[in-house]
Interface confidence: medium
């Protein structure tokens, strides 16, 4: 999916009433230095591209996110800000749901919010220049 | 199928109050997210507000203060309480369930004027 046509400030807005909450209620507990950033993204298309595959994506090691409450947030505000987004991605959830695993909170799922937070930080200071 | 039904507009003065309802049925609904969009004649359809299953609220900046959304899971209903509305809240609201955005209902009708 192309990220190019979302709309962004609204997308920011989500993240900033909610979906940050949700971030470090799910971090609650780990330091923030425990865990080195190694995903970057350098646009805000690119962000929600990078921010959409950590949170979807099953991964070695993490394959509980897609049920978390910010992952949830982050669907809704994806599904109503960026055009034509939800039809790419129904079937995908539907099986998705047919599938349900136990929700688990692994060190490699703490790392990969810890990425997923520094991707949002990215999305929301898109002026900035690339470290 | 997941079916939407919306009420409770009407035709309201400057300064007054309404509370829409929208009944949902084919889903589990306290685990969705749930919206109120609204279009205004000539504009896109824009989300006013959204409730999650935790219980969390969102709302656009234009209605914050304003308008409080709420959710009966034992009855799939929603609820948006629209308090102190302008002439530009004037709009057919519509809501929404989670992937749902293309089973919209006949929305409802609210109209600020005097």
């Known amino acids: 999916y192309d990220f190019t046509n979302c709309d962004f400030e609204k997308i920011k807005a989500a993240y900033l009433s909610t979906i940050s909450k949700d971030l470090i209620t799910y971090m609650s507990g780990t330091k923030s230095t425990e865990f080195n950033n190694t995903v970057s993204c350098s646009n805000r298309p690119h962000c929600l591209t990078e921010i959409q595959s950590l949170t979807f994506n099953p991964t070695a090691g993490c394959a509980s996110l897609a049920k978390e409450m910010f992952a949830m947030k982050t669907k809704a505000a994806l599904a109503i800000w960026c055009p034509g987004y939800s039809e790419t991605q129904i079937n995908a959830t539907q099986a998705m749901k047919k599938r349900r695993k136990r929700k688990v909170t692994t060190n490699k799922c703490l790392e990969q919010v810890s990425q997923l937070q520094g991707l949002w930080r990215r999305f929301n200071r898109p002026l900035l220049k690339q470290q | 199928e997941v079916q939407l039904v919306e009420s409770g507009g009407g035709l309201v003065q400057p300064g007054g109050s309404l509370r829409l309802s929208c009944a949902a049925s084919?889903?589990?609904?306290?685990?969705?997210?749930m919206g109120w969009f609204r279009q205004a004649p000539g504009k896109e359809r824009e989300l006013v507000s959204a409730?999650?299953?935790?219980?969390?609220?969102y709302y656009a900046d234009s209605v914050k203060g304003r308008f409080t959304i709420s959710a009966d899971n034992s009855k799939n209903t929603a609820y948006l309480q629209m308090n102190s509305l302008k002439p530009e809240d004037t709009a057919v609201y519509y809501c929404?369930?989670?992937?749902?955005?293309?089973?919209w209902g006949q929305g409802t009708l609210v109209t600020v004027s005097s």
């Open positions: 929404a369930i989670d992937w749902y955005l293309n089973s």
């Open positions: 409730i999650f299953s935790d219980g969390s609220t």
């Open positions: 084919g889903f589990i609904f306290s685990s969705y997210w």
